[in-house]
Interface confidence: medium
Amino acid sequence: SLGSLAAAEPAVIAECKTRTEVFQISRNLIDRTNANFLVWPPCVEVQRCSGCCNNRNVQCRASQVQMRPVQVRKIEIVRKKPIFKKATVTLEDHLACKCETIVTPRPVT
Amino acid sequence: SLGSLAAAEPAVIAECKTRTEVFQISRNLIDRTNANFLVWPPCVEVQRCSGCCNNRNVQCRASQVQMRPVQVRKIEIVRKKPIFKKATVTLEDHLACKCETIVTPRPVT
């Protein structure tokens, strides 16, 4: 709305940088062939690039990434009894970000 | 995968709490009747509840919210010239979070 301007602070751009995000650990990251199990924990924190850039046609992208393996519990319920196994999920953390030009493919003439 | 367990740290649950997120300011928040304008800044930071809860059938939800009006620029392009106007967008910040039971409607018998 265009009203109540007085009380409003000027909006500050969310700069392009790494922020803590929540990553849901989906079961198919652990086992694509079986669905009869649970994963614990169901979500973890990751560092990801987000925010906006000062110009159009540029996008906030990761310029440096790091893969981080973490152990999760794979909990299979077999005959009403849980079987716990360790599984490794590899998370991707963004270490640095940059505003990168979006390359749009030129139409073939 | 179940391999390379040694190098992996145990995964830590992303607890239910407020985190800084990036909110894209869409044009229809400012003017639903007109699309011939740009908004600056295109995105801002907000505080939002995210993460997982320790138990089944519970979800991370905001328990306290605050509305925060911010001023943005509405940039209309008229005859190839920009016209700057002020507009107010009301953002929603989450101040506190809680793990809340998901009420699933019972089937009617």
């Epitope: 009894k81 849980p82 360790k86 | 320790n54 089944r56």
Partner: antibody, heavy 120, light 107 residues
């Protein structure tokens, strides 16, 4: 205050029965798995039985299978262990303990224990 | 049935590092927890999921687990750390405890 309080222990003859209770307070009992662990005099810890948050999953140590039954009443915040056909080797301090998750995990809260003596 | 083996006793001088081992077949494939029990008291969790410390447990307690052996390490051991220590793992549908290790702080 978060706590677990066991009761129901005592002296019982071999072949007899006993029902242990564990009253939980200070946390949402219905959200967590629970276990019973015992410790014979001068000996180490022995896990006895487990029950998930809603009671749908239960399992027992081989040494008590078929004789002991674990149950819970979430409306009363209470865990139970029904012990039948008791033997001298069941003599121990019985602890109830809380898991941090609905499915189990480590035991992050223990009661003070209740002594069960099986003797003629 | 699955067994966890601990040394019956470990002795350490105050200020030194104490290491208590827990061994079992492919133990590194399971999450190991450690409990401390002082005479006449209930057990207390000191390490969970191999290497995590619950709040309130001093930083001198640490843990590791790989291969067939999990280790509880107490650095800068204090007199108050004298107790029985039990490792535990959830394996094959049952929680298993090691036989326990009596830690004696000399002096």
């Amino acid at each position: 205050e978060v706590q677990l309080l066991e009761s129901g222990g005592g002296l019982v003859q071999p072949g007899g029965s006993l029902r242990l209770s564990c009253a939980a307070s200070g946390f949402t009992f219905s959200s967590y798995a629970m276990s019973w662990v015992r410790q014979a005099p001068g000996k180490g810890l022995e896990w006895v039985s487990y029950i998930s948050d809603d009671g749908s999953l239960k399992y027992y140590a081989d040494s008590v299978k078929g004789r002991f039954t674990i149950s819970r009443d979430n409306s009363k915040n209470t865990l139970y262990l029904q012990m039948n056909s008791l033997r001298a080797e069941d003599t121990a301090v019985y602890y109830c303990a809380k898991h941090p998750y609905w499915y189990g995990g480590q035991l992050d809260l223990w009661g003070q224990g209740t002594l069960v003596t099986v003797s003629s | 049935s699955y067994e966890l083996t601990q040394p019956p006793s470990v002795s350490v001088s105050p200020g030194q590092t104490a290491s208590i081992t827990c061994s079992g077949d492919s133990l590194g494939s399971y999450f190991v927890h450690w409990y401390q029990q002082k005479p006449g008291q209930s057990p207390v969790l000191v390490i969970y999921d191999d290497s995590n410390r619950p709040s309130g447990i001093p930083e001198r307690f640490s843990g590791s687990n790989s291969g067939n052996t999990a280790t509880l390490t107490i650095s800068g051991t204090q007199a108050m750390d004298e107790a029985d220590y039990y490792c535990s793992a959830f394996t094959h549908n049952s929680d298993v405890f090691g036989g326990g290790t009596k830690l004696t702080v000399l002096g």
